[in-house]
């Protein structure tokens, strides 16, 4: 229904504390170097506003789009063109092409310094003073460093961390209390950023029905009790919330998201039995809590796939009358049946069956051409199954750290022209799958490890188009979403690649290494290696581990000497010698 | 093309029954959720009562609860509305529906008219 003023329908339905933290995000996310101080007072002047558009809403102004309200705003920010560049041409454009322009100057690798943790007693302080600005601040740095993350998903983070606080800085250890409790939440945030921003890709690169298409997948393995009509008024409107916030209409996004977890509250018996739990909670955590809800128990008599897909002698009939359906319900039945395969997994093979009727359904005997279909399937099935397996093994026998440099010689060799930061984030991300995934029960393996692997490399190729340097990347990246994941690791080295010259200063360290966190450690230790690899991107893992070993030796031996820096300055070149010997 | 019709209305005392039907053709009938939509004179539409491709699941609006019974005969694509206990707010025009999506229908027959009066 039509509003006569939008910004104070918003208002009404989200509550004032929800709208400020919305109208926050949007900002953060849009204009990325801004301080705190200066987005909060723009929110602030926005939600003025908007009360006087609920007092009246025939006031000035008050039937603007939303667009038009925080264009304006934004472009009236002093010294826009010093700080943004050719971002202050957008506002030069109208709406709608104002906002496009703006999504489209969204830096997904800003260059910002890392979001560090205040000390406990000053994190506890600062948030006792003033609640509200703290948990402001982290809005704020969340998300302009994750200019697409989710935006309500953001505000239960915020209230996650807001509860953390208020149990911990009340007990007289508030470090060993805060410490884990923060990790969990920054852990499981930086997962659902790189998820959100492959579902925002999705929706850029390949349209609604692209995303909608996942969104079936995905609902019919949650929900495998709810018919096809239920699931595609989920998956038409989770497009629609997902639409929103990748769009920037962060208010919309909100709200609807909230009218979807009320709707599917309200029809648990046509959904699934296991929502309950989620619906007694209050909106935030009711919403979270729905969008990774444990799948329902799969009915027990579902019928073979074959006998509507395959058997039926009308199937070329029934795909030709209403193809997008037909696929729909295709990928509906398949899916709901396995929960234990991945999305991608699903949709490649909803991919392979649509190619196989357009081609069947063109010939004399379309059931003979497209009878074996199913059993065509089975290479696609057991791809994945096998990358989970080999990475499984190596994980256990490896480690997290120890699998992520195997990931990450893997990665250097296939890719070698890609920045050493960017193969180092990546490799390590890649390698959290091992303790994400691979100590859960097996069929649930192969859709956490493939979903997650998904995401990462979509992250990759983001990067990576900002300056495309390898050409392999540049492949796997333009492919459709789904085949992204077996293109990459299909990948082989590089043979185009023209090895790096030695230097020496890559592999000369210091001892200021010896002070920092073991996180950091791990990061000059895998950069050394990447190096190492694209001087030799032929090394076999024997060499490497010679090297690395060695590596580790040394660190380990100065880090403990008295004279650090003596022993650094005198060893670190005898290091070098035996690293160019091992890898001759 | 899609085509569902109605049949079985009728004029009808306080307290009868009736049976309606609806044939459906041009689609692809066990793979939707269908439905029965009534529009009473001078009133909007309202679901009267839908039910699952595969039967398992109807649901009724609260007015119809207890006395319509809806069931579905996929080997015939055929659609049934029993409708006991009928009252004079009964009367309506009564529609078959496709449902493609919940709470949405994307085709609907020419109706058939229950009248209920003594």
């Known amino acids: 229904e039509a509003h006569k003023s939008e910004i104070a329908h918003r208002y009404n339905d989200l509550g004032e504390q929800h709208f400020k933290g919305l109208v926050l995000i949007a900002f953060s996310q849009y204009l990325q170097k801004c301080s705190y101080d200066e987005h909060a007072k723009l929110v602030q002047e926005v939600t003025d506003f908007a009360k006087t558009c609920v007092a009246d809403e025939s006031a000035a102004n008050c039937d603007k789009s939303l667009h038009t309200l925080f264009g304006d705003k934004l472009c009236a920010i002093p010294n826009l063109r010093e700080n943004y560049g050719e971002l202050a041409d957008c506002c030069t454009k109208q709406e709608p092409e104002r906002n496009e322009c703006f999504l489209q100057h969204k830096d997904d690798n800003p260059s910002l310094p890392p979001f560090e943790r205040p000390e406990a007693e000053a994190m506890c302080t600062s948030f006792k003073e003033n609640p509200t600005t703290f948990m402001g601040h982290y809005l704020h740095e969340v998300a302009r460093r994750h200019p697409y993350f989710y935006a309500p998903e953001l505000l239960y983070y915020a209230e996650q961390y807001n509860e953390i606080l208020t149990q911990c800085c009340a007990e007289a250890d508030k470090e060993s209390c805060l410490t884990p409790k923060l990790d969990g939440v920054k852990e499981k945030a930086l997962v659902s950023s790189v998820r959100q921003r492959m579902k925002c890709s999705s929706m850029q690169k390949f349209g609604e029905r692209a995303f909608k298409a996942w969104a079936v997948a995905r609902l019919s393995q949650t929900f495998p009790n709810a018919d096809f009509a239920e699931i595609t008024k989920l998956a038409t409107d989770l497009t629609k919330v997902n639409k929103e916030c990748c769009h920037g209409d962060l208010l919309e996004c909100a709200d609807d998201r909230a009218e979807l977890a009320k709707y599917m509250c309200e029809n648990q018996a046509t959904i699934s039995s296991k929502l309950q739990t989620c619906c007694d909670k209050p909106l935030l955590k009711k919403a979270h809590c729905l969008s990774e809800v444990e799948h329902d128990t799969m009915p027990a008599d579902l019928p073979a796939i074959a006998a509507d897909f395959v058997e039926d002698q009308e199937v070329c009939k029934n795909y030709a009358e209403a193809k997008d359906v037909f696929l729909g319900t295709f990928l509906y039945e398949y899916s709901r049946r396995h929960p234990d395969y991945s999305v991608s997994l699903l949709l490649r093979l909803a991919k392979k069956y649509e190619a196989t009727l357009e081609k069947c359904c063109a010939e004399a005997n379309p059931p003979a051409c497209y009878g074996t279909v199913l059993a065509e399937f089975q290479p696609l099935v057991e791809e994945p199954k096998n990358l989970v397996k080999t990475n499984c093994d190596l994980y256990e026998k490896l480690g997290e750290y120890g699998f992520q440099n195997a990931i990450l010689v893997r990665y250097t060799q296939k890719a070698p022209q890609v920045s050493t930061p960017t193969l180092v984030e990546a490799a390590r991300n890649l390698g959290r799958v091992g303790t994400k995934c691979c100590t859960l029960p097996e069929d649930q393996r192969l859709p956490c490890v493939e979903d997650y692997l998904s995401a990462i490399l979509n992250r990759v190729c983001l990067l990576h188009e900002k300056t495309p340097v390898s050409e392999h990347v540049t492949k796997c990246c333009s492919g459709s979403l789904v085949e992204r994941r077996p293109c990459f690791s299909a990948l082989t080295v590089d043979e185009t690649y023209v090895p790096k010259e030695f230097k020496a200063e890559t592999f000369t360290f210091h001892s200021d290494i010896c002070t920092l966190p073991e996180k950091e450690k791990q990061i000059k230790k895998q950069t050394a290696l990447a190096e190492l690899v694209k001087h030799k991107p032929k090394a076999t893992a024997e060499q490497l581990k010679t090297v690395m070993d060695d590596f580790a030796q040394f660190l380990d031996t100065c880090c403990k000497a008295a004279d650090k820096d003596t022993c650094f300055s005198t060893e670190g070149p005898n290091l070098v010698t035996r690293c160019k010997d091992a890898l001759a | 093309e899609v085509q569902l019709l109605e049949s079985g209305g009728g004029l009808v005392q306080p307290g009868g029954s009736l049976r309606l039907s609806c044939t459906a053709s041009?689609?692809?009938?066990?793979?939707?959720?269908m439905g029965w939509v009534r529009q009473a004179p001078g009133k909007g539409l309202e679901w009267v009562s839908w039910?699952?491709?595969?039967?398992?699941?109807?649901y009724y609006a609260d007015s119809v609860k207890g006395r319509f019974t809806i069931s579905r005969d996929n080997s015939k694509n055929t659609l049934y509305l029993q409708m006991n206990s009928l009252r004079a707010e009964d009367t309506a025009v009564y529609y078959c529906?496709?449902?493609?999506?919940?709470?949405?229908?994307?085709?609907w027959g020419q109706g058939t008219l229950v009248t209920v009066s003594s």
């Open positions: 041009g689609f692809t009938f066990r793979h939707y959720r």
């Open positions: 039910i699952r491709p595969d039967g398992t699941f109807t």
């Open positions: 529906a496709k449902s493609y999506m919940a709470g949405t229908f994307d085709y």
